[in-house]
Interface confidence: low
Amino acid sequence: IIPVEEENPDFWNRQAAEALGAAKKLQPIQTAAKNLIIFLGDGMGVSTVTAARILKGQKEEKLGPETPLAMDHFPYVALSKTYSVDKHVPDSAATATAYLCGVKGNFQTIGLSAAARYNQCNTTRGNEVVSVMNRAKKAGKSVGVVTTTRVQHASPAGAYAHTVNRNWYSDANMPGSARREGCKDIATQLISNMDIDVILGGGRKYMFRMGAPDPEYPHDYSQDGTRMDGKNLVQEWLAKHQGARYVWNRTELMQASLDPSVTHLMGLFEPGDMKYEIHRDPTLDPSLMEMTEAALRLLSRNPRGFFLFVEGGRIDHGHHESRAYRALTEAVMFDDAIERAGQLTSEEDTLTLVTADHSHVFSFGAYPLRGSSIFGLAPGKAQDRKAYTALLYGNGPGYVLKDGARPDVTESESGSPEYRQQAAVPLDEETHAGEDVAVFARGPQAHLVHGVQEQSFVAHVMAFAACLEPYTACDLAPPAGTTD
Amino acid sequence: IIPVEEENPDFWNRQAAEALGAAKKLQPIQTAAKNLIIFLGDGMGVSTVTAARILKGQKEEKLGPETPLAMDHFPYVALSKTYSVDKHVPDSAATATAYLCGVKGNFQTIGLSAAARYNQCNTTRGNEVVSVMNRAKKAGKSVGVVTTTRVQHASPAGAYAHTVNRNWYSDANMPGSARREGCKDIATQLISNMDIDVILGGGRKYMFRMGAPDPEYPHDYSQDGTRMDGKNLVQEWLAKHQGARYVWNRTELMQASLDPSVTHLMGLFEPGDMKYEIHRDPTLDPSLMEMTEAALRLLSRNPRGFFLFVEGGRIDHGHHESRAYRALTEAVMFDDAIERAGQLTSEEDTLTLVTADHSHVFSFGAYPLRGSSIFGLAPGKAQDRKAYTALLYGNGPGYVLKDGARPDVTESESGSPEYRQQAAVPLDEETHAGEDVAVFARGPQAHLVHGVQEQSFVAHVMAFAACLEPYTACDLAPPAGTTD
């Protein structure tokens, strides 16, 4: 499809002149930030951003790539180098330490410097690094964590936990030796390391004693509580604050978010990760956009401001499965949450960052016609005279041989939410990729997000913008609309 | 390898504090640009940038990803949307029209709006769009084109040509009907459309009559001249200017670039594309860095300034062959040219942009250890119990089945310059990819390069920065060090 208006050079010249005008008008907001929001698209490399843009554009009945995402409207962009201290291609644990604590760590460790060693409990103590969320709380701000994964997952855990093993969700996931040496599981750290005002996501089963039936799936033993210490961590957390409320479904979340007596809110909507957006039951589970809105409602009551971490955590899971449909629909939902947050906050006092922890070996190639489905086939056939998709993976479970040859694919197969795009190398799980990811920034001090930076720089921009440790002497005018 | 200094949080905190300090000091250069340089890495998507960074770092005996490329030092970054009017994933012709002329066009067409149709000569007239280089020449600046491909190739042709078919290198590549309708081959347009002061790259055979022996390969008929009109375009070009000089090897280039009587310089160093850097004979052919230096020497004599296009054009070719070794060594050489240009120019009066026309379905995955070779194997085995490489392609000639199965690979095989990384789908040629590419900017008005933009914006930033059409009323102070 060739849009007739785009045939005219004036279309492009006018559009560019407008973009230039906007660029010339762009003025850095030189005050401090009252609020900090970081949107983390787990696994959302640049190829995922572009493919999600096309999908979202086509959902709006446009051709696709011309239609900006919410994140595309952010005025400043930088590239972030994601390697961990020990690996060229990192995981979500080491990267969370970087962008949330400002220090790079080792693969599979969280909230610890690289002096800590994976799985070695005795290398924990003394190597903890403190997250910007923790520093924001110490400065009197309200803080929140929202994710579509379990709240004890690597990315959100970077905001509150210190562990040599990202898989220690509950004590049942830990070896006895580590427990005996005094290491704490992540669920325990969630409720005891610091005071978090809003906690929304999945992860119920790690909070309750082994065998405790799940409220949503009482007859499914695999969803039971997992804790071996017999504790009820939700109960313990509720006991800490008079205004604390625990919810486990969408209706309760909506009620709680509108209730002025609720000061602390924990919502755990699934035993493990939340469902993919395409499988979500909207009567039972909130969307990421709804969780974001609920969190902002509560947090924005604090006159000192807030820190909010919001993760589209299952973009990554879709890619690991070699299922681009899942990854991209998650990415579109993630962008919807960014859009909503933009409507509910002001760029005059809120620094909003959007970034990824790492990328995936996911590519969008061939030479598909403009307006064709992002999940569609490439024009023409491959050398083996079979069709192939525009979307492909470098490695992963999409690799299949049928009778010693690459399987053919039809347009209807390739458009299925279950379809796994083909890969060059067969792996149980498609891997992350090591290329730089984008950081999009808007609000006070967003102009500091520039050029090519280490991923750890992201945490420092947030800390500096809000005059948190170690930048309390930031020398910035107070945020818009505040009186000191 | 875990570098001991990186185990200390101070290492990262200090580094980030320095980066913040630099970001805070960053002041837009608000004057006009005297000179414009655009460095175009053909096919240099973000995954290629990161992999090249690791390769260059390791060549310098560092671990790799921590070591900045020359382009990494540029203060401003934007993302560029590369789709063409008719395709989600573009080619180098449509994209050249965008970043050099400021208007998006159709696949395989050059210097024409999207009202033109591929291969239809009669849709050319009236649809021409004018390049920034052409506008710079009209404003009295000197202009140059430097590339490692043939100078009539799609990317450089975007600076001077208008053609419905990028493959019309010489009249021998055109159908008779197109010639009869008055369409001109690209080599003819190179010498007749506009006055270009410096032309350096490959492409000798398109300039001489069919059967004319090549000076470097006189006994190889496949390298003979190709022109059917019997013309000697080099002779015609030399006749246009008293100070014009033609060279075809490195020694002659060096002499000419130091000769003050030379005002116009054409250097064509191969019959077709120049050799890959790893195959180059340094006694016969100049490197991209040397060509860039020679061009800058000549162009910078003009007190009104210059426009220079420099292309690392064979990054793209290495990827098309599924040979990452070639693509990445070309990318490192491209970065060396950027570094040299930075030493020879001042950011006070020169706007330098570095970008790509499009990406490739090239990924850098698995979880390789820090410091391991970029061409090395992934840790562990694939599901088929065979080794696999960290670098892989989505599609391309790297797809091979051996006895109905994926072939194994060793570390020594994967490190060979000839090795083709595996791909998910077998194609003669690996394809481009459609995700956004980075634009790096330094110098006057570089701060306008921000956020997510259409690729056509790139040309407008250059035109505006130098107060060229349509921005002659740019309202910018004159460039540093000039008197009006």
Epitope: D91, R166, N167, Y169, A172, N173, Y221, S222, G272, D273, D316, H317, H320, D428, E429 | -
Partner: nanobody, 122 residues
């Protein structure tokens, strides 16, 4: 639904041996990783050993290393825990569990058996 049934527990003298079996029904064992856990009276459940279905990774808790061996017999859809040089502190209810490992989720055991008692007397 996947079901796991342990057997082979009993009373044994210190220094003796036992072989526990874990029969899996409802799904091919090759889809899962198998873990063995134990819980002594008044204590937390603790990890003993695990093996991935393809045999590529086996791990033992330090307290049983060199004495216990975990194995899988695909044909019978059964996993085994061979225990030798037993000590009184090995007395516990032993559970087998089936689950999957993924980098995104970590080690997770989705299905558990009801347990079999092992008592080691001095």
């Amino acid at each position: 639904q996947v079901q796991l049934v342990e057997s082979g527990g009993g009373l044994v003298q210190a220094g003796g041996s036992l072989r526990l079996s874990c029969a899996v029904s409802g799904r091919a064992l090759s889809d899962y990783n198998i873990g063995w856990f134990r819980q002594a009276p008044g204590k937390e459940r603790e990890f003993v050993a695990r093996k991935t279905w393809d045999g590529s990774s086996t791990r033992y808790d330090d307290s049983v290393k060199g004495r216990f061996t975990v194995s899988i017999e695909d044909a019978k859809n059964t996993a085994y825990l061979q225990m030798s040089s037993l000590k009184t502190e090995d007395t516990a209810v032993y559970y087998c569990a089936a689950g999957r490992y993924s980098r995104a989720r970590g080690w997770e055991y989705d299905y558990w058996g009801q347990g079999t008692q092992v008592t080691v007397s001095s």
